[in-house]
């Protein structure tokens, strides 16, 4: 399924600001980290991030006790997000705890830049993608994924963190954006809307899709997320739009069928390992790429975003399950958990394919207004 080219803007439904809880992969155990023989890490001791504040944001990390032989991130303070005046307020919010602005929400005060100045940065995410204005870059080769087909054991942690559903990924999932641009997957999470209201974070010519998956990666040049935050290319996110199709998506069903178990905010369950690559589109060669930020506080910039041109199809029932099962803080449904699109401010979105060609019925002739910045690669 190619991205539809919309002639007119679609109504944007939804929340306003931040990404979800993704990162925080604090100390990745290194290859040399031998567990202690007496009691090596157990099935549930997955290295990786706990509940972090933002998709792209970074916590301070504390190692777990030595006996468990494996490191986890602690819960990090999160910040509250501002509402988007043009959008309805999202009721999935967190209550304030005194003056401690340690939690963020979609559609609430205080404004994010007050808590994390980077949220007012010039190169933020998500953005609206206009294929006609994308720069065709032949140097952008097909993405390479290795180790994404996980065996059923060890099981993975699936958690409702109050602003998304997040699957913590084990070490060993390798992704390359190109030669020398290698990453390790940390976690994946989803963004969605509500009944009849789409909830993707990125848009295409103003069109918002029903939902969006983000797989968050840390550059192999860094051992910890907090080292990579704000560094160009330190983090990379693979993003794909989810659309309604006629059939049930069996890969997604392995996760969606477990959402009732984690309906309550802060709850989690263990799910068998699965083929993570099956959650993404099959065409790894056609995508858009740009440099942006985490979509939740701390909104750190330097994040490489790769948005697939091909979409993933879920059944109507599955999309309904996604948007209508989880609860956020208090008695509010976890819905419309997306940030409003941010201005490009001169950034050029690159495409791995000639996206301007046949991209919109409005264009009689293909126009490629921008040149590829990586042409010499």
């Amino acid at each position: 399924q190619r991205l539809p080219r919309m002639q007119e803007d679609s109504p944007l439904g939804g929340g306003s600001s931040g990404e979800d809880d993704p990162l925080g992969e604090e100390d990745l155990p290194s290859e040399e980290d031998s567990p202690r023989e007496e009691d090596p890490p157990g099935e549930e001791d997955l290295p990786g991030e706990e509940d972090l504040p933002g998709e792209e944001d970074l916590p301070e990390v504390k190692p777990k006790s030595e006996e468990e032989g494996s490191l986890k991130l602690e819960d990090l303070p999160t910040v509250e997000a501002p509402g988007d005046p043009q959008e309805p307020q999202n009721n999935a919010h967190r209550d304030k705890e005194g003056d401690d602005q340690s939690h963020w929400r979609y559609g609430g005060d205080p404004p994010w830049p007050r808590v994390s100045p980077a949220c007012a940065g010039r190169f933020q995410s998500p953005v609206d993608i206009r294929p006609q204005l994308a720069a065709f870059c032949p140097a952008l080769r097909p993405l390479e994924l290795l180790g994404f087909q996980l065996p059923p054991l060890p099981e993975l942690r699936l958690r409702n963190n109050g602003h998304s559903v997040q699957l913590t990924l084990p070490p060993g999932l390798e992704m390359a954006l190109g030669p020398g641009r290698e990453y390790r997957a940390l976690q994946l999470h989803l963004h969605w809307g509500a009944a009849g209201r789409p909830g993707s974070e990125h848009t295409v010519e103003g069109h918002r899709f029903p939902a969006e998956i983000h797989v968050v990666h840390l550059s192999t040049a860094f051992a910890r997320v907090d080292e990579a935050l704000g560094r160009p290319g330190g983090l990379a996110v693979l993003a794909a739009f989810l659309e309604e199709g006629p059939e049930e998506n069996s890969a997604y069903e392995q996760l969606l069928s477990r959402l009732e178990e984690i309906a309550e905010e802060g709850s989690e369950t263990q799910v068998p390992g699965l083929d993570i690559s099956a959650l993404l589109p099959s065409d790894f060669s056609r995508y858009f790429q740009y440099e942006g930020s985490l979509t939740t506080p701390p909104c750190a910039q330097g994040v490489i975003w790769t948005v697939f041109n091909q979409t993933v199809m879920l059944s109507a029932k599955q999309l309904h399950t996604l948007s209508d099962t989880l609860w956020g803080p208090g008695d509010s449904r976890l819905q419309l958990n997306f940030r409003a699109t941010q201005p490009l401010n001169g950034r050029v979105i690159e495409a791995s394919f000639p996206a301007g060609v046949d991209s919109s019925p409005r264009a009689a002739e293909p126009v490629q207004l921008n040149s590829c910045l990586a042409a010499g690669d």
Epitope: P35, D39, P41, E43, E44, L146, Q149, L153, G172, P272
Partner: antibody, heavy 121, light 112 residues
Framework: QVQLVQSGGGLVQPGGSLRLSCAAS????????MSWVRQAPGKGLEWVSA????????YYADSVKGRFTISRDNSKNTLYLQMNSLRAEDTAVYYC??????????????WGQGTLVTVSS | QSVLTQPPSVSGAPGQRVTISCTGS?????????VHWYQQLPGTAPKLLIY???NRPSGVPDRFSGSKSGTSASLAITGLQAEDEADYYC????????????FGGGTKLTVL
């Protein structure tokens, strides 16, 4: 001391049943997936079955699916393998093994001493 | 026939270096899955020797090392000693099989 102590092997006729037990000590049993691995006389290792730490998920090799059942009692720190409709080709030393989670990959890091199951008429 | 292929036997004199190969395919080792190695001394249960391709559990001498490249892995033993005489097995996962845990057929190491 981390250890796995097995019991329950023996001689059984084809079509018969047997239950193997594996008592764990020295570690938090419920935090680990566990497996059964067997070794036919003079042959190599063959994975038989696995169970998640909570017991909620179970997995089997095709050769035993529908005949063997893996289970665990976390309150007793014990792993079980119920073997029904036994065949001559099931004759082997059966090992229980702990699945240590190293870098997100399960390795069999602690093994029981093994128990011989002989299926013969 | 095993999914992972190992030589049936290797041998070496004390003090020498020997390697044991473990060859798989794009659905197991080549798919990025870790390889683990086990040592089984005569009449005993297997023991974890190398985990995650090249990591030694505590207590395993540094004479043992592992590596992985493409669809193959190998176990190297330097400074061979008489007590190293045993069967060695590699283990990984295979995405194409319902029996997703796979072992090599085993290699008998003889110390001459």
């Amino acid at each position: 001391q981390v250890q796995l102590v097995q019991s329950g092997g023996g001689l059984v006729q084809p079509g018969g049943s047997l239950r193997l037990s594996c008592a764990a000590s020295g570690f938090t049993f419920s935090s680990y997936a566990m497996s059964w691995v067997r070794q036919a006389p003079g042959k190599g290792l063959e994975w038989v079955s696995a169970i998640s730490g909570s017991g909620g998920s179970t997995y089997y090799a095709d050769s035993v699916k529908g005949r063997f059942t893996i289970s665990r009692d976390n309150s007793k720190n014990t792993l079980y393998l119920q073997m029904n409709s036994l065949r001559a080709e099931d004759t082997a030393v059966y090992y229980c093994a702990r699945n240590g989670n190293y870098r997100g990959s399960l390795a069999f890091d602690i093994w029981g001493q093994g128990t011989l199951v002989t299926v013969s008429s | 026939q095993s999914v992972l292929t190992q030589p049936p036997s290797v041998s070496g004199a004390p003090g020498q270096r020997v390697t044991i190969s473990c060859t798989g395919s794009s659905s197991n080792i080549g798919a990025g899955y870790d390889v683990h190695w086990y040592q089984q001394l005569p009449g005993t249960a297997p023991k974890l020797l190398i985990y995650g391709n090249n990591n030694r559990p505590s207590g395993v001498p540094d004479r043992f090392s592992g590596s992985k490249s493409g669809t193959s892995a190998s176990l190297a033993i330097t400074g061979l000693q008489a007590e190293d005489e045993a069967d060695y097995y590699c283990q990984s996962y295979d995405s194409s099989l319902s029996a997703w845990v796979v072992f090599g057929g085993g290699t008998k190491l003889t110390v001459l």
